[in-house]
């Protein structure tokens, strides 16, 4: 807590500028106006202050907004939103996606810090729903955010948005996420021809039921086996041999290298030996 | 043993409808696609449809497309064929098979549909 | 559509003669091309499917081979209960289709 002290003679600021980083801690304290810092934070990023500086500067705008910074002063927080705690962030309304950028940006590069993951959480449920701009940001500065999120909140994410995720968006989704996500992304695609539906598609299919994945035999799509090992069991089960032959087309003969790793093994104990030598693999069941 | 037998066959007048229905039996009928397949007389095979395990999903030729539709009752293991807009070209012996990936692997015995005025 | 082309429509063959039909596909099907053989008045029974694998029941004297677009099949010993019509079929695209047939009579 710095002390309340006098502003010396001929130091009030009159304006945010550079000659503030030779300001001691009661100096800021007692010189800077709150009302001006609000009105010139955009210029506070350009200064290279001290931590203990922003400490100071943090605490003028808490005292000048005690139930939580306006949009107009957070969007031009900058490295100011480091300093930031989550019953901060809290007390903030973030509705503009330009304002949410301008502070991810702050924390490029880190891991998802509990400050940002308050600050997406109240973005998020300020706008009701993860549209696809917001979803099209989050990912591109965490592509893991998806992933994330529970199956309960994933299931807001509308199917419009779905057309922001990219494949590394997916990877550390488990079972219960896809098997959320992989309805959205169907409806997403749905009027997408066979080769180009079948690109979109592939990294949800951890989620797609058999009578999706007998469908998709359908449709030449040669599916790879990195792909077919995410599938879950209990679709490809009831997969006959005439249709997995299908679905994997060329790359069928992956199978053999994969026989003793589910999918696959499941799958192989539950054909008949005679279906399972017309593969030519050796696969024994 | 997988057993498939249709009826519903029968003389229809040219833009009249008819149900056609196949009922299976010997395997689960619901872990399988499901097809039908005509022959006019004296003439070779042409597939008219195929629906999904499910009934999700349904596929046709050009042919076909728009005046037919596939349907299946999974509880009553009973596979169907509504013909609407019947031309003279659709006069032919209906089968219906069950479809396994890219094979026609069972075959009912067909029924005989007419369109004449 | 990918069109089917059997060869011949009909042919003549005696009980133990070795009989060959080819099929020829309008593109590329992969192995994805089933047989089927039908009796007068019958339904289809599958006899080959994926080129070359027999249908469970299926004699052995019935063979297939093949791949990309042309495809035979092949019955290295005619027996009487062979004589009928024989349908190559790709599955390879939708829409799936048949060849026209080809009639095996007795000569």
């Known amino acids: 807590e710095v002390e309340k002290t006098a502003c010396p003679s001929g130091k009030k600021a009159r304006e945010i500028d550079e000659s503030l980083i030779f300001y001691k801690k009661w100096e800021l304290e007692a010189c800077v106006d709150a009302a001006l810092l609000a009105t010139q934070m955009d210029r506070v990023n350009a200064i290279p202050f001290t931590y203990e500086q922003l400490d100071v500067l943090k605490h003028k705008l808490d005292e000048l907004y005690p139930q939580g910074y306006p949009e107009s002063v957070i969007q031009h927080l900058g490295y100011l939103f480091l300093k930031m705690s989550p019953e901060d962030i809290r007390k903030w309304n973030v509705t503009s996606l330009e304002t949410l950028k301008a502070l991810l940006e702050v924390n490029k590069g880190h891991e998802m810090s509990p400050q940002v993951a308050t600050l997406i959480d109240r973005f998020v449920k300020g706008r009701g729903q993860l549209d696809k701009d917001t979803l099209d940001t989050l990912t591109a500065f965490y592509p893991g955010y998806l992933c994330s999120l529970s199956p309960e909140e994933l299931s807001s994410v509308p199917p419009s948005s779905i057309w922001a995720v990219r494949p590394q968006d997916l990877d550390t989704c488990d079972p219960r996420q896809l098997d959320v996500l992989y309805p959205k992304a169907r409806l997403a695609f749905q009027n997408m021809n066979g080769s180009e539906y079948f690109v979109k598609i592939q990294s949800f299919l951890g989620g797609a039921p058999t009578e999706d994945l007998k469908a998709l035999s359908q449709q030449n799509v040669s599916m790879d086996l990195a792909t077919f090992m995410k599938l879950r069991t209990d679709a490809v089960l009831p997969l006959t041999v005439a249709e997995v032959q299908k679905l994997l087309g060329p790359h069928v003969e992956g199978l053999k290298a994969e026989e003793r790793h589910r999918p696959v093994r499941d799958w192989i104990l539950r054909q008949r030996q005679d279906d399972l030598d017309t593969l030519g693999l050796g696969l024994q069941g | 043993e997988v057993q498939l037998v249709e009826s519903g066959g029968g003389l229809v007048q040219p833009g009249g409808s008819l149900r056609l229905s196949c009922a299976a039996s010997g395997y689960t009928f619901s872990d399988y696609f499901m097809s039908w397949v005509r022959q006019a007389p004296g003439k070779g095979l042409e597939w008219v449809a195929t629906i999904s395990n499910g009934g999700t999903y349904t596929y046709y030729p050009d042919s076909v497309k728009g005046r037919f539709t596939i349907s299946r009752d999974n509880s009553k293991n009973t596979l169907y064929l509504q013909m609407n807009s019947l031309r003279a070209e659709d006069t032919a012996v209906y089968y219906c098979?069950?479809?396994?990936?890219?094979?026609?692997?069972?075959w009912g015995q067909g029924t005989l549909v007419t369109v004449s005025s | 559509d990918i069109q089917m082309t059997q060869s011949p429509s009909s042919l003549s063959a005696s009980v133990g003669d070795r009989v060959t039909i080819t099929c020829r596909a309008s593109q590329d099907i992969s192995n994805y091309l089933n047989w089927y053989q039908q009796k007068p008045g019958k339904a289809p029974k599958l006899l080959i499917y994926y080129t070359s694998r027999l249908h469970s029941g299926v004699p052995s004297r019935f063979s297939g081979s093949g791949s990309g677009t042309d495809f035979t099949l092949t019955i290295s010993s005619l027996q009487p209960e062979d004589f009928a019509t024989y349908y190559c079929?790709?599955?390879?695209?939708?829409?799936?289709?048949f060849g026209q047939g080809t009639k095996v009579e007795i000569k």
């Open positions: 098979a069950r479809f396994d990936g890219y094979i026609f692997d069972y």
């Open positions: 079929q790709q599955g390879n695209t939708l829409p799936y289709t």
